[in-house]
């Protein structure tokens, strides 16, 4: 599976579209996860609505939003207020029971505004790889200052 490389500017939004065979993936929820290592776990960031017929509704976790057009066969993920810490290798997944089929691998590269040296704060990655949803995310306004926020849901 080829990796798509996408670039985004820090502070702006980045939209990712993953296309799939609408018939083959009929009735399946979609998910967006971050790969923690080359052969390591892919931590769930966000997944589409639990009721498949409502998959078109936007579902949010922190600054990441997912919505699925099940007729067109396109799942759209939006990374809002992109930060340097959002850079990484991600997967669009189609969920079938406990199994996840990779639809697309996406490498997100975050380009800094040379006049604005900002970065994300520490990200809490759950030790278990089953779910990333509800993870604690801390943001900061500069590389050397860290501010904690309560967990997102």
């Amino acid at each position: 599976l080829n990796t798509t490389v996408l670039q985004g500017m820090a502070g702006q939004s980045l939209r990712v579209s993953c296309t799939y065979d609408a018939l083959k993936h009929w009735g399946r929820r979609k998910a967006w996860c971050r790969q923690l290592g080359e052969e390591g776990p892919c931590q769930r960031v966000v997944s589409t609505h639990g009721v498949w017929l409502l998959a078109f509704l936007k579902k949010r976790n922190g600054s990441t939003v997912i919505a699925d057009d099940t007729l067109a066969g396109t799942v759209t993920i939006t990374l809002k207020n992109l930060q340097a810490g959002d850079a990484g290798l991600y997967q669009c997944q189609s969920l079938r029971g406990r199994e996840a089929e990779v639809l697309q691998k996406v490498l997100v590269e975050v380009l800094e505004d040379p006049l604005d040296d900002q970065d994300a704060g520490d990200l809490w990655v759950p030790e278990e790889s089953s779910s990333f949803e509800g993870a604690q995310v801390e943001h900061s306004t500069s590389r050397n200052q860290e501010t904690s926020f309560p967990p997102t849901s």
Partner: antibody, heavy 119, light 107 residues
Framework: EVQLLESGGGLVQPGGSLRLSCAAS????????MAWVRQAPGKGLEWVSS????????YYADSVKGRFTISRDNSKNTLYLQMNSLRAEDTAVYYC????????????WGQGTLVTVSS | DIQMTQSPSSLSASVGDRVTMTCKAS??????LAWYQQKPGKAPKLLLY???NRFTGVPSRFSGSGSGTDFTLTISSVQPEDFATYYC?????????FGQGTKLELK
Amino acid sequence: EVQLLESGGGLVQPGGSLRLSCAASGFTFSNYYMAWVRQAPGKGLEWVSSLTNSGGSTYYADSVKGRFTISRDNSKNTLYLQMNSLRAEDTAVYYCTREWAGSGYFDYWGQGTLVTVSS
Amino acid sequence: DIQMTQSPSSLSASVGDRVTMTCKASQNVGNNLAWYQQKPGKAPKLLLYYTSNRFTGVPSRFSGSGSGTDFTLTISSVQPEDFATYYCQRIYNSPWTFGQGTKLELK
């Protein structure tokens, strides 16, 4: 097999310049962030600089900011570190490393090249 | 910047021993921590990332735990090839700072 091979180290006088190179093979170079980490003789590890897979953004430790420049040539699978205004405290083994997808940990390292700054 | 402090600075063990070394961050870093092993004259090697994930080829006797500010690297049964210096590193958010290292020596 991932391989990183540094070159360009040597003896240089304080205030001088040196350019380190790192030839990468065994992986899709343009898909990875890269970094330099150094280790002074008998001391611990210190992150020096990183850059994104396209080279569009660069990051530096405060100790080298304004003096060192990291860059890459994806067509040649090569990473560079231009070091100017060198000081005695820059004496170290410099390691070329592959940084996992912007996560700040280094999954593969070169064998290192020694830079000695002395008069 | 967040400081990483390792303890002890050195420890002695025999083959087969269970050893534990710690890494303390000056601020909460979630579980954004990596561990490396370095032998004299060699480049460091990645052992664990995000606190507890073993890198490719790393034996199961190496394990990591902790979160927030306190982290532990455990070698369940030390082997001859494990005598080396171990470094922790705060990851995910720059600057990526390392601890000063813990040297594991043969008793």
